[in-house]
Interface confidence: medium
C-alpha cells in the first residue's frame, strides 16, 4: 500500500493544533430524518440546509422541514425557517438554485390536498424570501433558463407546461399534456406533447415542439417522437420508424429546423439509447443490445452527430434508466472510464485516453497484488467501482472523483484482478489522468478534493461504528495524516465541500443518537493554516499530459495536440488559492490516420488504423440524407475526429456534393424538410442526459 504515517512521509508540522483551531462544530436541534445541502452561488460561502421529517398517515404524508443558512462555508448556521413561514419544503425537489452566481433560490412547498402549490423565492442568496402561490402543483423541480435566471419552466402534476418570465412572480400556461420539457440554448424551450391526453401510453406518438419566444409562438419540429434529448449543440429525437416498434435517432444542429440521419442501429421497444456524454464537438451514444442482455455498444459521433464509429462493445448498462459506470475523467482531456460485461459475465473496467478511439484495461497499480479473480497472479488490471457496484449493494460509498482544476488527479474505489471483485474495495489514486494508479487507502472511504488538488481529504466508511477521524494528504495521496476532529464519534453520513474543489473547507456531517435524543451535527474544518503560504512559481513543475514515450516526437499528442501543464509539486505544501487558474501550453501535432474517424460507408478492421470500405457498399454511390437534402459523398474513407486540432502530416481528401434533391421520410412531420434518423429513450422518458444539480442528500 501507499506510505501511511511513517518516516518516509513528509509530515505537516503542528497540524493537530492548526486544525483544532479551525474546526467548527454546529449542532442542529432537530429530529428530522433526512438532510440536504445546496450551495448558493460560487465562492459566496452560502449554504442552505434543508432538514425534513415525513410521516405517512393513511393516504397523505404529514411532514415538517427546517431551513438553515450559512454564509461562512458551513462553520456557522442560522435557522431561517421563519423566513418561509415554517412551511414544509419538499425534500425531493424542494431547493432549486439559480444558474451561475445569480443568487436566486426557489423553494417548492408541499401543500397537501391543494389544487395549487406555493413557492418561496429569493434573489439575494437566501437572505430574504417572497412567498408566491402557484396555480398548479409541480411534478418536478422548477427549471431555470441557463441564459436568464428570471425565466422559469415548470411541469405540473397534470402534465401542463408553465412558464414565468419574472422569476416566478407570474405564471402562464404554455401547453397541455406535455410529457417532457427542456430548456435549450437562447431561452428556447423544447417539449413533447400528446394530443391523446396521456404520457404513459402512446410513447412513440408524441409531437416535438419548440418555442423560441417563451410561448408567443410554437413550431412542431417532429412527430412520431418517442423521446428527445439535448447534448452539447445537438438535439436528438428518437422516432418511430414505421417498421413495427422500431425507433431510430434523428439529430439536428439547428434547433430542429432540419434533421439528419444518425448512422446508428434502430432499436425495439425493449431497448434504449442513452447519451453518455456530449459536448459541442461530439457525442458518446450507448445503443442497447436486444433482449435483457444488460449491455450494449458505445458509438462516438462525428462533428455533426450523424456518422458514428463503434467505440466499445459489450458496454455495461443494465436496463432503461439503469446503471452504467461510464465516467468522464474531467481532470484530463479525452479520458473516460467505464465497465464492460465480459463473455464470462464478469464485469471489467476499461479506459480510453483518446475520447473513445481505443479502450484498454487499467494498468495494475505497482503497489498492489492481483486478487483471487486473477488467473495469472502476476498479470491483472485495476477495476473501478462506480454506479453499478453501488447499485448491487457493494460497500462503495462514492463514485470516482476528478476535478478539471485538479489536473491529472482521479480518485476511485477499486479492486485488482481479472474483473471487479465483490470483496471490500480499496481507494486508488491516479495523478496522471488514469495512466498509472497507486493504492492510497485501505478499505472504503468518502473522499473529496480541496484547493484544486492541494489537499485530498478522506473519511473511512464505517457503518457499524462512529467516526471521529479525518485523513488528509497534501501530496496527491502518497502520504496521509490523521486528525481526530471530535472526542465523541458521530454516526457519519457524508462529506460536503463546495463544488469546484477550490475551497479549503470540508464539512463532516452525521448525527448523534441516544435512547431519548437524536440530532444532526456538522464539523467544518478549514485547512487554511495547513497550507500557510501562497504557492509561488518554484512550487510548480512542468508536466506533459498523456506522455507515454518521451522519446517520441509526437509524445503526448491526443486529438491532434499536446498540452504541458504547470502542476503543483508533491513536496510543496502551499495554497493554490481560490483564484487558481490551470496553466497550460498547447502545441499542435502533425496529423496521422489516428486523427481521423472512418467516414460513412467505411470501417476500421481490428488493430488497423486504415479505414476500408464496407463490403456491402463497395462500388455503390454513397448517398445519404443531410439537413433534408440528398448528398453524394466522395471520400477516401476518413473524416477528422471532432475536436482534433492536428495540422499537416497525413491529409485524406473528402468532398460532399449536394445532389439538389430533397429527401424526406415519414419519421418526422411531412410538412417539413425531414430525414431518416435514429432515436432514444432513457430513464424518465428522455435520453439519459447526465446533468445533475449540485445537491447533497443524506438519510439515516
Amino acid at each position: 500500500s501507499a506510505p501511511g504515517e511513517d518516516e518516509e512521509c513528509g509530515r505537516v508540522r503542528d497540524f493537530v493544533a492548526k486544525l483544532a483551531n479551525n474546526t467548527h462544530q454546529h449542532i442542529f436541534n432537530d429530529l428530522s430524518g433526512s438532510v440536504s445541502l445546496s450551495w448558493v452561488g460560487d465562492s459566496t460561502g452560502v449554504i442552505l440546509v434543508l432538514t425534513t421529517f415525513q410521516v405517512p398517515i393513511f393516504m397523505i404524508t404529514i411532514g415538517q422541514s427546517k431551513l438553515y443558512r450559512s454564509e461562512d462555508y458551513g462553520k456557522n448556521f442560522k435557522d431561517i425557517t421563519d423566513l418561509i413561514n415554517n412551511t414544509f419544503i419538499r425534500s425531493d425537489f424542494g431547493i432549486a438554485i439559480g444558474p451561475e452566481n445569480s443568487g436566486k433560490v426557489v423553494l417548492t412547498a408541499d401543500v397537501s390536498g391543494s389544487h395549487g402549490s406555493r413557492i418561496f423565492r429569493s434573489s439575494d442568496f437566501a437572505k430574504n424570501f417572497v412567498q408566491q402561490e402557484l396555480p398548479f402543483v409541480p411534478l418536478m423541480q422548477i427549471m431555470y433558463s441557463p441564459q436568464n435566471s428570471d425565466y422559469l419552466l415548470a411541469l405540473s402534476n397534470k402534465n401542463e407546461l408553465w412558464v414565468s418570465k419574472n422569476f416566478g412572480g407570474k405564471w402562464e400556461k404554455l401547453y397541455d399534456t406535455v410529457c417532457l420539457a427542456k430548456w435549450g440554448s437562447d431561452n428556447t424551450i423544447f417539449f413533447t406533447a400528446n394530443h391523446n391526453g396521456s404520457c404513459s401510453n402512446d410513447r412513440g406518438m408524441l409531437e416535438l415542439w419548440r418555442t423560441s419566444d417563451l410561448g408567443k409562438s410554437f413550431k412542431t419540429i417532429g412527430s412520431k417522437i418517442y423521446s428527445f434529448g439535448l447534448g452539447g449543440r445537438f438535439l436528438f429525437a428518437s422516432v418511430m420508424t414505421g417498421k413495427g416498434t422500431l425507433r431510430a435517432i434523428h439529430v439536428s444542429t439547428d434547433q430542429g429546423d432540419t434533421w439528419s440521419m444518425a448512422q446508428l442501429p434502430p432499436v425495439g421497444h425493449e431497448q434504449f439509447y442513452s447519451i453518455l456524454a456530449a459536448n459541442d464537438d461530439m457525442v458518446f451514444m450507448h445503443v442497447d443490445e436486444p433482449g435483457d442482455s444488460g449491455f450494449g455498444t458505445i458509438f462516438t459521433s462525428d462533428d455533426r452527430g450523424i456518422v458514428y464509429s463503434k467505440s466499445l462493445e459489450r458496454h455495461l448498462y443494465t436496463t432503461t434508466g439503469g446503471e452504467t459506470d461510464f465516467t468522464n475523467v474531467t481532470s484530463l482531456r479525452g479520458v473516460y472510464i467505464t465497465s464492460i460485461l465480459a463473455e464470462d459475465k464478469s464485469v471489467q473496467s476499461m479506459i480510453t485516453f483518446d475520447q473513445g478511439g481505443r479502450w484498454t484495461h487499467l494498468r495494475k497499480p505497482e503497489n498492489s497484488k492481483c486478487d483471487a479473480t486473477a488467473r495469472d497472479p502476476e498479470k491483472c488490471s485495476l477495476h473501478i467501482h462506480a454506479a453499478y457496484s453501488i447499485a448491487t449493494g457493494l460497500n462503495v460509498p462514492m463514485l470516482p472523483l476528478s476535478e478539471p482544476n485538479a489536473v491529472g488527479i482521479v480518485i476511485a474505489h477499486g479492486s485488482v484482478g481479472d474483473a471487479i471483485s465483490v470483496m471490500r474495495p480499496d481507494v486508488y489514486i491516479s495523478d496522471d489522468g488514469g495512466y498509472s494508479w497507486t493504492k492510497a487507502l485501505e478499505g472504503p472511504h468518502h473522499y473529496t478534493i480541496l484547493d484544486s488538488g492541494g489537499i485530498i481529504v478522506a473519511v473511512e466508511q464505517n457503518a457499524h461504528q462512529g467516526v471521529n477521524q479525518i485523513k488528509f494528504s497534501t501530496d496527491e495521496g502518497q502520504c496521509w495524516q490523521t486528525y481526530n476532529f471530535t472526542k465523541d464519534p458521530i454516526f457519519f453520513t457524508g462529506l460536503a465541500s463546495e463544488p469546484g474543489a477550490r475551497s479549503m473547507n470540508i464539512s463532516i456531517w452525521g448525527y448523534r443518537s441516544s435512547l431519548f435524543h437524536q440530532y444532526w451535527i456538522s464539523y467544518t474544518i478549514d485547512f487554511k493554516d495547513i497550507l500557510e503560504r501562497n504557492c509561488e512559481e518554484k512550487d510548480y513543475t512542468i508536466w506533459l499530459a498523456h506522455s507515454t514515450d518521451p522519446e517520441d516526437y509526437e509524445d503526448g499528442c491526443i486529438l491532434g495536440y499536446k498540452e504541458q501543464f504547470l502542476r503543483l509539486r508533491k513536496s510543496s505544501v502551499c495554497q493554490n488559492g481560490r483564484d487558481y487558474v490551470v496553466t497550460k501550453q498547447p502545441s499542435i501535432c502533425l496529423c496521422s490516420l489516428e486523427d481521423f474517424l472512418c467516414d460513412f460507408g467505411y470501417y476500421r478492421p481490428e488493430n488497423d488504423s486504415k479505414c476500408v470500405e464496407q463490403p456491402e457498399l463497395k462500388g455503390h454511390d454513397l448517398e445519404f440524407c443531410l439537413y433534408g437534402r440528398e448528398e453524394h459523398l466522395t471520400t477516401n474513407g476518413y473524416r477528422k475526429i471532432p475536436g482534433d486540432k492536428c495540422q499537416g502530416g497525413v491529409n485524406p481528401v473528402r468532398e460532399v456534393k449536394d445532389l439538389k434533391k430533397k429527401c424526406t421520410s415519414n419519421f418526422l412531420s411531412p410538412e417539413k424538410q425531414n430525414s431518416k434518423s435514429n432515436g432514444s429513450a432513457g430513464g424518465s422518458g428522455g435520453l439519459n442526459d447526465i446533468f445533475e444539480a449540485q445537491k447533497i442528500e443524506w438519510h439515516e
Epitope: 518521451p550 522519446e551 516526437y553 509524445d555 499536446k562 504541458q564 499542435i588 495540422q647 499537416g648
Partner: antibody, heavy 121, light 109 residues
Framework: EVQLLESGGGLVQPGGSLRLSCAAS????????MNWVRQAPGKGLEWVSA????????YYADSVKGRFTISRDNSKNTLYLQMSSLRAEDTAVYYC??????????????WGQGTTVTVSS | EIVLTQSPGTLSLSPGERATLSCRAS???????LAWYQQKPGQAPRLLIY???SRATGIPDRFSGSGSGTDFTLTISRLEPEDFAVYYC??????????FGQGTKLEIK
C-alpha cells in the same frame, strides 16, 4: 552557459570515413534530442540526422541513410556522427544542434560553431 | 516530402524599414513545428522564432512570426543594421524529419 562544440572534421577521400564529435555543456544533455545539420559551400541548410534523448530512436535524411550513423554517450555528454562511404556532395560545414526537450519541439535552439568536412581526391 | 519555398530570394531594404519574408509549404504544416533562423556570414544559424509565432530567448520584439497551414511570414518591424543576413524557415515533419527553405537574403539597399 549552454554550449556545443564540434570536432573531427577534415579532408577525406571519396569512399572514406570520418567520425564527428559534439561536446555538450551547460544543460541536461540526456533530456534533449540532438541533430546534425550541414551546409554545403554557398548553399542552404540541410538536416542530416537526429537522435532522441536516450539514444533509443535515430532518424536520417534519405541522402545519408545507410552511410551515416548517429549515436550519443550521455555519460560523456557527447554526440557522434560516424560517416562512411563519403561522397563529394557530402562536403559541407556540419553543425551539431540541440533539438527538442521532452514534450515539445521548440526549434533548434542551440547550435555549435560547425566543423568542416571536405571530400575530395 | 514537404517542400518549403521562401520568397523573395533577395530582399533589398534600408535600416528603419519593415521587412516581410514569406515561407510557403507544399502541403499543410503544423504551426507548432515551424521555425525561423537567422544566419550571418561565417556564423552558425540562430533560432529566432519557433511554433510559428513564439520568439526564442533573447530575440528582440521587432521580430515576429505569423501564419498557419501553408503560408507563414517573418516580419521585422524596423530594420537594424545587424538584421541584414540570410533567413531560413524550417519545418518538423515526418519524413524527412526536418526540411529548410532555400533561404531569403536580406541585404542593405
Amino acid at each position: 552557459e549552454v554550449q556545443l562544440l564540434e570536432s573531427g572534421g577534415g579532408l577525406v577521400q571519396p569512399g572514406g570515413s570520418l567520425r564527428l564529435s559534439c561536446a555538450a555543456s551547460g544543460f541536461t544533455f540526456s533530456s534533449y534530442a540532438m541533430n546534425w545539420v550541414r551546409q554545403a559551400p554557398g548553399k542552404g541548410l540541410e538536416w542530416v540526422s537526429a537522435i532522441s534523448g536516450s539514444g533509443g530512436s535515430t532518424y536520417y535524411a534519405d541522402s545519408v541513410k545507410g552511410r551515416f550513423t548517429i549515436s550519443r554517450d550521455n555519460s560523456k555528454n557527447t554526440l557522434y556522427l560516424q560517416m562512411s562511404s563519403l561522397r563529394a556532395e557530402d562536403t559541407a560545414v556540419y553543425y551539431c544542434t540541440r533539438g527538442r526537450g521532452i514534450g515539445y519541439y521548440n526549434g533548434m535552439d542551440v547550435w555549435g560553431q560547425g566543423t568542416t568536412v571536405t571530400v575530395s581526391s | 516530402e514537404i517542400v518549403l519555398t521562401q520568397s523573395p530570394g533577395t530582399l533589398s531594404l534600408s535600416p528603419g524599414e519593415r521587412a516581410t519574408l514569406s515561407c510557403r509549404a507544399s502541403q499543410s504544416v503544423s504551426s507548432s513545428y515551424l521555425a525561423w533562423y537567422q544566419q550571418k556570414p561565417g556564423q552558425a544559424p540562430r533560432l529566432l522564432i519557433y511554433g510559428a509565432s513564439s520568439r526564442a530567448t533573447g530575440i528582440p520584439d521587432r521580430f515576429s512570426g505569423s501564419g498557419s497551414g501553408t503560408d507563414f511570414t517573418l516580419t521585422i518591424s524596423r530594420l537594424e543594421p545587424e538584421d541584414f543576413a540570410v533567413y531560413y524557415c524550417q519545418q518538423y515533419g515526418s519524413s524527412p524529419m526536418y526540411t529548410f527553405g532555400q533561404g531569403t537574403k536580406l541585404e542593405i539597399k
